[in-house]
Interface confidence: medium
């Protein structure tokens, strides 16, 4: 229903505690340079007509659409060409032009250091002074660094860590408790991060449509007891709250969020036997719950699949006559009876399918043409399940840190022109999908490791877009967004990359890496070993082992030396020969 | 648009029975809800019965203990058999589902006339 004043309308569905954090993440997304206390300054501001506009709907500006309303203030910034550059041209355009224009300059690897997580004690000083500014601050950095980051679900680690450290600060030894504690959060913050991005990379890409079958098949495997038309129903909600999200409409896409969690708590008879848990919860944590709820028990009598897609002879009929409903349901079926495949599996398969009936269905016995496709499906299962078999294996065998390093050779040779920071944070992510995935049970396997997979090859095609020096990885992140995953997996050595020319300075060190953390000394290390195989992108693995190994060996000599710079002066250059040497 | 196709409407005696058939595609039959309405002259078109694809079934007050919704998988029919028929139950019965991605879809409807 039309409201007069939108962002009366809002706040008054939101309250005020939520609709501050989400106008907060909404200005740290759109301008991700300015500091905390302007933004803030401007949330107040907002807040404040806001709430003008709940006492008398018809008040000045009060029927202007959000869009206009933060536009106007983002615009109204002192010196924002001088901090922004050509973001201030945006101004000068109308809406929903200057709303698009804002979007395509939000920037996915600003230049911002990383988030520095302050000392335990020092961090609940600050927190018991003020927790409502200490949290703001915890949105401010997490939604700037991340400008496309789920609005909704980081309000809820706000509200974890605000739980966090309201336990944690009253203990003795405050960072044994807080440590373990923020490092979960943020560990599932990340992830919650590149898992976002790939949404609205879906959506900027092929449109809702796309998105809507991807919701789809996982609305299907958590829900296999709800009907088609539930599932569609529940899909069309999260593909227009997605597209608000994606699209900067932080409060709209938050009141439509907690209106879907309603609805299914309201509706659980017709959707699972699983969700009552979630219910009881309060409408950040219900959301949450319901997002990460566990998939129900497969109805025990479903029919095989080839009766209706394969067996049944008006197929191409079905399929003439309603071709998204027969696709659909096509998709609902399968994806209902396999939640142990990956949602880019189960896509995979629908698009086979719906090949196959355009090919089939134009000939002349159809029935004889497509009557072998579930069968002609297995090449497309096989190829992930053997994926994740020999990549569980090796993160088996080497652990967490030899699997990153192993996947970094890997994809330095696959894509040598790619900047090594990029590769590095691509290998250290894609590598963690051991620790993450291989662990679980085996029907769990699939759809954690290539579903993980496709969301951080996402960031890495969005970051090349930026900056693009690699035709392969351009090749494999301009076609579809399921086939991804398999086109970097197909990838081999890049023969036409000419190789870096040896410079010693990129493997010195100084006595400065001792003092790292151990994350910090790993990422240095695997800088170096990016580099050695930029230079040598067909040395073997063992040549690799034998330098890394003496890179390990000095580093670890020289932090115990007693002068530590002398050692680093004079060991590093025979490093340097040596490894010239093995590599030659 | 998706069809579906009525039959087995006709003339009965009050106290008669009739059972009507809607043909459709199975896979629409099997994964979505599917109804039986009805529209009596002058009348506004009102829920006879609807049949969930679990087996669920739901009617109206004014059916319940006469009418018997189903359906057979194997033949692609959804089935509404009508027993105790009363002068009230005549109007033209549609058969009806709502496809998702797409607007309602209804049968052309068949005529059941209860009289004597």
């Known amino acids: 229903e039309a409201h007069k004043s939108e962002i009366a309308h809002r706040f008054k569905d939101l309250g005020e505690q939520h609709f501050k954090g989400l106008v907060l993440i909404a200005f740290s997304q759109y301008l991700q340079k300015c500091p905390y206390e302007e933004h803030i300054k401007l949330v107040q501001e907002v807040t404040d007509f806001a709430k003008t506009c709940v006492a008398d709907e018809n008040a000045e500006n009060c029927d202007k659409s959000i869009h206009t309303l933060f536009g106007d203030k983002l615009c109204a910034i002192p010196k924002l060409r001088d901090n922004y550059g050509e973001l201030a041209d945006c101004c000068a355009k109308q809406e929903p032009e200057r709303n698009e224009c804002f979007l395509q300059h939000k920037d996915d690897n600003p230049n911002l250091p990383p988030f520095q997580r302050p000392e335990a004690e020092a961090m609940c000083t600050s927190f018991q002074e003020n927790p409502t500014s200490f949290l703001g601050h915890y949105l401010h950095e997490v939604a700037r660094r991340h400008p496309y980051f789920y609005a909704p679900e980081l309000l809820y680690y706000a509200e974890k860590y605000n739980e966090v450290l309201t336990q944690c600060c009253t203990e003795s030894d405050k960072a044994a408790c807080l440590t373990p504690k923020l490092d979960a959060v943020k560990e599932k913050a990340l992830v919650a991060a590149v898992r976002q991005r790939m949404k609205c990379s879906s959506m900027q890409r092929f449109g809702e449509r796309a998105f809507k079958a991807w919701a789809v098949a996982r609305m299907s495997q958590r829900f296999p007891n709800a009907e088609f038309a539930e599932i569609t129903k529940l899909a069309t909600d999260v593909t227009k709250i997605n597209k608000e999200c994606c699209h900067g409409d932080l409060l709209e896409c938050a009141d439509d969020r907690a209106e879907l969690a309603k609805y299914m708590c309201e509706n659980q008879a017709t959707i699972s036997s699983k969700l009552q848990a979630c219910c009881d919860k309060p409408v950040l944590q219900k959301s949450q719950c319901l997002a990460e709820i566990e998939h129900d028990n497969i109805p025990a009598d479903l029919p095989s699949i080839a009766a209706d897609f394969v067996e049944d002879k008006e197929v191409c009929k079905n399929y003439a006559e309603a071709k998204d409903v027969f696709l659909g349901t096509f998709l609902y079926e399968y994806s209902r009876r396999h939640p142990d495949y990956s949602v880019s599996l189960l896509l995979r398969l629908a698009k086979k399918y719906e090949a196959t009936l355009e090919k089939c269905c134009a000939e002349g016995d159809p029935p004889a043409c497509y009557g072998t496709v579930l069968a002609e499906f297995q090449p497309l299962v096989e190829e992930p399940k053997n994926l994740v078999k020999t990549n569980c294996e090796l993160y088996e065998k080497l652990g967490e840190y030899g699997f990153q390093n192993a996947v970094l050779v890997r994809y330095t040779q696959k894509a040598p022109q790619v900047s090594t920071p990029t590769l590095v944070e691509a290998a250290r992510n894609l590598g963690r999908v051991g620790t993450k995935c291989c662990t679980l049970p085996e029907a769990q396997r699939l759809p954690c490791v290539e579903d993980y997979l496709s969301a951080i090859l996402n960031r890495l095609c969005v970051l090349h877009e930026k900056t693009p020096v690699s035709e392969k990885v351009t090749k494999c992140c301009s076609g579809s967004l399921v086939e991804r995953r398999p086109c970097f997996s197909a990838l081999t050595v890049d023969e036409t990359y000419v190789p870096k020319e040896f410079k010693a300075e990129t493997f010195t060190f100084h006595s400065d890496i001792c003092t790292l953390p151990d994350k910090e000394k790993q990422i240095k290390k695997q800088t170096a070993l990016a580099e050695l195989v930029k230079h040598k992108p067909k040395a073997t693995e063992d040549q690799l082992k034998t330098v890394m190994g003496d890179f390990a060996q000095f580093v670890d000599k020289c932090c115990k030396a007693a002068d530590k710079d002398n050692c680093f002066a004079t060991e590093g250059p025979n490093l340097v020969a040596r490894s010239k040497e093995a590599l030659a | 648009q998706v069809q579906l196709v009525e039959s087995g409407g006709g003339l009965v005696q009050p106290g008669g029975s009739l059972r009507l058939s809607c043909a459709g595609p199975g896979f629409l039959l099997r994964s979505n809800t599917m109804g039986w309405y009805r529209q009596a002259p002058g009348k506004e078109r009102e829920l006879v019965a609807f049949i969930r694809p679990s087996g669920l079934t739901n009617y109206n007050d004014a059916v319940q203990g006469r009418f018997t919704i189903s359906r057979d998988n194997s033949k692609n029919t959804l089935y509404l058999q009508m027993n105790s028929l009363r002068a009230e139950d005549t109007a033209v019965y549609y058969c009806?589902?709502?496809?998702?991605?797409?607007?309602?879809?209804w049968g052309q409807g068949t005529l059941v006339t209860v009289s004597s």
């Open positions: 009806h589902t709502r496809p998702p991605f797409q607007r309602d879809s």
